[in-house]
């Protein structure tokens, strides 16, 4: 007799891991034999989809590999024409293994800042993140965290946050656990003991002392007055991350002795400083006005303008001289890279010389003004046009700082080298001849001035600027 | 009463070809998934391949696919398994099995007598 | 494949013993396995089938259980006539495969 279908085996939720086998079993009594079809969340499952497996009329439906895509509702439906089609449903579950996908990696970080280790995790059910940092479990405080993506934050790095973290996940089906990483806790170089300034006799020996710390242990280099240290003995102990520097000295002169902590961050250096004044009993003090020092330049952008070896004088009126000196040239030469080319090497020497003046090292260090002719020179023959314009834009306030103003000397109130040839510098590097001159293109309607003397010539020339003079 | 029996077995050298064949009575042949299980010499049970009733699903032990062909004859209540480059490691005796949906998946419920196929050089 | 270990590969004991043999499947099969009995020379025949059903005409000194990925099958009360192989077979897949059987041997 005829029967209506009836499903006496209903489908149940199945559990599977990811490439494992799932099996739906959809049960069905009927006369004549009934038709099954399957459904995945109410989509027609395609029978002939080699991912599945049909077995005895469809009764069993197998997911032969399953997928993370494969979790859903399914559903068969059983019809022999006879009577309603019946239907039962089950879900499948697709469970996975806890897995690392976005494992932690070594991290270099500097105190204080906020570190964050990632770990991303993959599973179902959801796995739940732990850390070990060395053989313990990490516990967590107001500090340190473990995110609810797994990943460990830490805020305010301290040094003892370093060492051996891996991340570990967890569910019902196993554990993963992540490769061990290095938290390293960098330190920005600090000065523990800085050197002691000394008012001595003439002749004497001073140590002078520094210790320093970071992560890495910094190194230590003394500056005099601005320059390396050329004489005196040097002695360096390093112990538990501490560097002691000794500065051994025979005084001869008054000096501003400076200790310079320097560690190295990734591609950034912190440095820390910390200075010592030696004075000399009875010692002349220096002009109210020249308040400075002689030293060798060593910046970049005059480089090519100074002579090799060029002693210079620092003002101590800026905090670090070298520095506050080398900026505004850098400025200056900044807005030379408009002019023409006549006028620019002439220009850069002059500012080069006038920022950075010839110092007289005697015993009060003295800057040496460059000579008026050479700043009209540079001002009337071969920036004139240049001139102009920018005393222009001066009056009519149209440069974004004053700092330029410093940059260009006023030729007038500068020694003529006629009063006094030792009283101002000369420049040597620009070079010409009088008998040259009318080869010149006219740059200025009106005649200099003032009558430019014979330059002295340069003996050595690094680029040719015209055929009349050149410049280095 | 549910009867199978096998047919075909003998000595082949490796290399060479061999049909079995299972004959079916009893039961509705064409209704039922048809299945060969094989044991070597002193060895345990192992499934070699199943067809369904209508030869729609059929189904190869990883090991074994390419090499051996199953096959049925509905009209004539016959099942084979056709057996090509033979080797000495196919030397074992061939169960012709009828498979039947249990109360949870399948079980073989009826086994025939055994087919011994001996492979040697 | 699901693999099926079953162990142990053979045991002796004493008529009227209680007799238990283990199969592990390598993941979750549900119920769907079955028990088989070898006497030799002879074919397989079917005793347990979706884990614990017991087929008509076997004795009911023989039953089944599951628990997780692990199936038993006990003896309770050895017979001499039960010497013989046992195996499991899993149907979740279709790639059936059967555990490597336990020898049942009388004292």
């Known amino acids: 007799l005829p029967k209506a279908p009836v499903i006496t085996t209903p489908l149940e939720t199945v559990d599977a891991l990811v490439e494992e086998v799932a099996t739906f079993m959809c049960a069905v009594e009927s006369y004549p034999q009934p038709e099954i079809s399957w459904t995945r969340n109410k989509i027609l499952i395609k029978l002939f989809d080699t991912r599945y497996s049909i077995r005895e009329n469809g009764q069993l439906l197998t997911i032969l590999s399953v997928e993370d895509s494969d979790d859903g509702i399914y559903c068969c439906t059983a019809n022999n024409g006879v009577g309603g089609a019946v239907e039962s449903c089950g879900a499948l579950q697709v469970k996975m293994k806890p897995k690392i996908t976005r494992p932690p990696i070594n991290v270099k970080i500097i105190e204080g800042l906020k570190a964050v280790l990632p770990c991303t995790t993959m599973g179902n059910p959801k796995p739940s993140v732990s850390w070990i940092k060395g053989d313990s479990p990490l516990r967590e405080n107001s500090r340190i965290a473990v995110l609810e993506s797994g990943s460990l934050r830490i805020h305010n790095v301290q040094k003892e946050d370093a060492g051996q973290y891996r991340c570990v996940a967890k569910n019902s089906l196993g554990t993963a656990y992540s490769k061990v990483v290095k938290l390293e806790v960098e330190v920005f170089a600090r000065i523990l003991r800085a050197p002691e300034s000394h008012n001595v006799t003439f002749g004497s020996f001073v140590t002078l002392h520094c210790t320093a710390t970071g992560i890495p242990v910094p190194t230590i280099t003394w500056i005099e007055n601005g320059n390396a240290v050329s004489s005196g003995s040097i002695q360096e102990s390093v112990k538990d991350r501490v560097i002691d520097s000794r500065l051994q000295l025979f005084i001869t002169k008054p000096g501003l002795y400076t200790c310079i902590a320097t560690n190295k961050h990734g591609e950034k250096f912190s440095t820390a400083k910390a200075a010592a004044t030696i004075s000399i009993a009875e010692w002349s003090k220096p002009q109210k006005d020249n308040k400075g020092y002689c030293a060798q330049y060593r910046g970049e952008v005059c480089n090519a303008v100074l002579a090799k070896d060029a002693l210079v004088f620092l003002n101590t009126s800026y905090a670090d001289p070298e520095e506050a000196q080398e900026l505004l040239v850098h400025t200056a030469w900044n807005e030379l890279k408009v002019v023409s080319p006549v006028c620019r090497p002439a220009a850069e020497a002059l500012l080069c010389n006038h920022i950075f003046q010839e110092c007289s090292p005697g015993v009060v260090p003295t800057p040496i003004p460059i000579c008026r002719e050479y700043c009209l020179a540079v001002k009337e023959l071969f920036c004139a046009k240049e001139w102009l314009v920018m005393e222009e834009k001066t009056h009519r306030g149209l440069y974004r700082s004053e700092m330029h103003l410093l940059s260009v000397p006023e030729c007038s109130k500068l020694p003529s080298m006629h009063w006094d040839p030792t009283a101002c510098a000369r420049l040597p590097h620009l070079d010409y001849n009088k008998e040259n001159l009318k080869t010149f293109p006219p740059m200025t309607s009106s005649k200099p001035s003032v009558d430019i003397p014979n330059l002295p010539s340069s003996s050595s020339s690094s680029f040719s600027v015209s055929p009349t003079y050149s410049m280095t | 009463e549910d009867l199978l029996v096998e047919s075909g077995g003998g000595l082949v050298k490796p290399g060479q070809s061999l049909t079995l064949s299972c004959a079916a009575s009893?039961?509705?042949?064409?209704?039922?998934?048809m299945a060969w299980v094989r044991q070597a010499p002193g060895k345990g049970l192992e499934w070699v391949a199943s067809?369904?009733?209508?030869?729609?699903?059929?189904y190869y032990a990883d090991s074994l696919k390419g090499r051996f062909t199953l096959s049925r004859d509905n009209a004539r209540n016959s099942f084979f398994l056709e057996m090509n480059s033979l080797r000495a490691e196919d030397t074992a005796v061939y169960y012709c099995?009828?498979?039947?949906?249990?109360?949870?998946?399948?079980?073989?419920?009826?086994w025939g007598q055994g087919s011994l196929v001996a492979v040697s050089s | 494949d699901i693999h099926m270990t079953q162990s142990p590969s053979s045991l002796s004991s004493s008529v009227g013993d209680r007799v238990t043999m283990t199969c592990r499947a390598s993941q979750r099969i549900s119920g769907f396995v079955n028990w088989y009995q070898q006497k030799p020379g002879r074919a397989p025949t079917l005793l347990i089938s979706?884990?614990?059903t017991l087929q008509s005409g076997v004795p009911s000194r023989f039953s089944g259980s599951a628990s997780g990925t692990d199936f038993t099958l006990t003896i309770s009360g050895l017979q001499p006539e039960d010497s013989a192989i046992y195996y499991c077979q899993q149907s979740y897949s279709p790639l059936y495969t059967f555990g490597q059987g336990t020898k049942v041997e009388i004292k």
């Open positions: 067809v369904s009733g209508d030869s729609h699903h059929i």
């Open positions: 979706a884990a614990s």
């Open positions: 009893g039961f509705d042949f064409s209704a039922s998934t």
């Open positions: 099995a009828r498979e039947r949906l249990l109360r949870l998946g399948v079980g073989f419920d009826s």
